[in-house]
Structures are given as C-alpha cells and as structure tokens.
C-alpha cells in the first residue's frame, strides 16, 4: 500500500507512517515503527500536558510565588496546569496571573462601582450630583447626600462630590 500523506485525528505522520499521539497527561518516549506502537509515559509529579501530543517533555506546573502575592486557586494535575490567584486585597496584573498588585482605592469624589476580585482591579466611578465620597477606599460606594427635608432641617451648606450637605435648623422667623 502507498504510504499515507495525512493521518486520522489523534495521529501524526512520521517516517511515512501514521503514529498515535500520546494522550493528555503523557509524553512521547518513542515514535511508532513497523514493529511497535507509539510509546508514551505519564508526566511526573508537578508536570502536565493538556493536549494529545508528541512532546518528549512535560511542562512544569506553574509556581504560585507567595513573594509575588500569589496563592494556589486550583492544584494542577497531569493534564492541567496549576491556576494561581492573588491573596486577599490583591489582584492579578495579567490574564496569566504571574504577579499581583494591591487593589486600587477610589479617591474622595469617587466611589466603588465594582469591588476588585483576585483577577480584576477595583472599578471606580465619579460620584454623580446628589452623591459623595469623602474617603479613599477600595470598598465604599458613593453615598447619597443627607436629605435635610426628611429631618425637618434645611441645607445650610451645599454638598459636593466629596462632602455631604450640612443641615441646620429652619429659620424660625420665616413664615
């Protein structure tokens, strides 16, 4: 028979033969021949391969370096890499999560729109009219100005995006 020019799924062409790829979690020891199947060996401890492959070396599991603020979110297996995330109060600097930075705080005049997670930073928004934030915080939303009316008080000092209104007693002389 003619030697093949293409092979089935989960096979590869070498020396005019279609050889089976190694399954996830295993690495290639030797290609198939006229006499033998492809030989594969399981990846070692702290190693993985996540696809059908012909790799002669497994990949090392990612190391979640605590010195970079990282911790293990999901332990790796022979078929999957370790997934790192950041310690509380920190978030990843990239999708690969190779290092962490402290969550950003929202300055006075800004409130937290979305609280940070292990993989995303704090999202801040300017306090709209009627709201304020007078602290730098990674958790505090913009607070509504105090409603003087509901307390039978009047506005003595207008609020800003950084300060609450100041309420005071109604002028008794007023009709």
């Amino acid at each position: 028979p003619e030697p093949p020019t293409a092979c089935r799924e989960k096979q590869y062409l070498i020396n005019s033969q279609c050889c089976s790829l190694c399954q996830p979690g295993q690495k290639l020891v030797s290609d198939c021949t006229e006499f033998t199947e492809t030989e594969c060996l399981p990846c070692g401890e702290s190693e993985f391969l996540d696809t059908w492959n012909r790799e002669t070396h497994c990949h090392q599991h990612k190391y979640c370096d605590p010195n970079l603020g990282l911790r293990v979110q999901q332990k790796g297996t022979s078929e999957t890499d370790t997934i790192c995330t950041c310690e509380e109060g920190w978030h990843c600097t990239s999708e690969a999560c190779e290092s962490c930075v402290l969550h950003r705080s929202c300055s006075p005049g800004f409130g937290v729109k979305q609280i940070a997670t292990g993989v995303s930073d704090t999202i801040c928004e300017p306090c709209p009219v009627g709201f304020f934030s007078n602290v730098s915080s990674a958790f505090e939303k913009c607070h509504p100005w105090t409603s003087c009316e509901t307390k039978d008080l009047v506005v003595q000092q207008a609020g800003t995006n950084k300060t609450d209104v100041v309420c005071g007693p109604q002028d008794r002389l007023r009709a």
Epitope: S20, V29, D31, T33, F35, T36, E37
Partner: antibody
C-alpha cells in the same frame, strides 16, 4: 546510511562476564529502540530485550533478566549488552537490531568454554 | 509467552514453484489499536535476518512482489509465487504484539 557495527567474536570462560557492543551510525541514535536477539543452532531466534538509548528505558524478556543488562553511551552512539555468570548455554550468535526499518548488526559470536 | 508455531519445518521446492509457509500463534496478535504485529524474515547462511513482510501483509522496501503475506488473529501465511534461487534459506515469523517478542522455529526452503 543506517549501520550497526558489532564487536568481534569472544571466547570466554564459564562464570565470567562478557560485554558486547553495537555502534549505531546514520540516524538519530536516541530516536529508536535497539533490540538484542540470540541465535543458537537448534534453538532458533530468541528475543532478549531492547533499550532506548539516552533515557535508558529498557524492556527485558524475563528469561534473560539477571543474565543480560543493557546500557547505552550517547557520546559514542553505542549500545552495550553485558552477559553475566556465563555458561555453555550462553554460547551463541548475538545480534543487535534497530526497531524501525530493517537494520541489523553482523552478529557477535560468543563461545563459552573451559 | 506467545508461542509461534511454523509449518512445515522443511519445504523442498523446484525453482519457479509456489511456496507457502504457515505460522500460528498461541494467542491473538491483534492489539488494542487493532494493529497486528506479525512479520516475516528470511535468513541466509552466515547472514543476519532480512525483513520481508511487516504487519501481516506489508512488503518491506525493496522486497520483490512475489512475496506476499496474509492472515489475521492467530493464523498467518507467507506465499512466494515463483521461487527463485536467491529465495532459499530459513524463513521466520516474528510477533511484536506481546512482550516478550517471539520468533517461530523457522522453515527451511530448499531445492527439491
């Protein structure tokens, strides 16, 4: 072109050890297993086992485990088979052959005699 | 171990005749990938064995098309359609499906 060159004939005393060599040329040495085969008149061909050079992965016919030991040296592209505690039953022609294609050494004649 | 039984032990033929050698294994040589690792070698006096057929019916590079292999499971046959003088020697079947790999006892093809 692919070639396997085996060491010359050996005459050994019973109880001694012999180390046969098989030098490979013309291909990537660490890419193929090399098998060893024993041939004695009236006993046909017997598969002793095989070695994958470099990583030194080995497979042995249980009948020869303890008798034969395979090693390899990637600096000289040579595979070795050590035969221990020789008896007259070990007198034979020993072939090395690449597992993949049809490449055999010329054979090494081992004679064990007192 | 898988025992490979070859028949006949000796096969006298005239040049130009067809020759047929049988090889039977003590267990199936079909592996989990549906491959059958049964092969045929020819050894001439003073020489190393030469591969003729691999995986039941595949002729090895440079082997004349008068050699053909067939069979499945445990029963296999090597046929030589028109024997030539250079075909004389000892034929061995060989299995590499199960470790340890094993050879048949050999069939001597000789002139009648």
């Amino acid at each position: 072109q692919v070639q396997l060159q085996q060491s010359g004939a050996e005459l050994m005393k019973p109880g001694a050890s012999a180390k046969l060599s098989c030098k490979a040329t013309g291909y990537t040495f660490t890419g193929y297993w090399i098998q060893w085969v024993k041939q004695r008149p009236g006993h046909g061909l017997e598969w002793i086992g095989e070695i994958l050079p470099g990583g030194d992965h080995t497979k042995y016919n249980e009948k020869f485990r303890g008798k034969a030991t395979f090693t390899s040296d990637t600096s000289s592209n040579t595979v070795y088979m050590q035969l221990s505690s020789l008896t007259t039953e070990d007198s034979a022609i020993y072939y090395c052959a690449r597992v993949g294609g049809d490449y055999w050494g010329q054979g090494t004649t081992l004679t064990v005699s007192s | 171990d898988v025992v490979m039984t070859q028949t006949p032990l000796s096969l006298p033929v005239s040049l130009g005749d067809q020759a047929s050698i049988s090889c039977r294994s003590s267990q199936s040589l079909v592996n989990s990938n549906e491959n059958t690792y049964l092969h045929w070698y020819l050894q001439k006096p003073g020489q190393s064995p030469k591969l003729l057929i691999y995986k039941v019916f595949n002729r090895y590079s440079g082997v004349p098309d008068r050699f053909s292999g067939s069979g499945s499971g445990t029963d296999f046959t090597l046929k030589i359609s028109r024997v030539e003088a250079e075909d004389l020697g000892v034929y061995f079947c060989f299995q590499s499906t199960h470790v340890p790999w094993t050879f048949g006892g050999g069939t001597k093809l000789e002139i009648k």
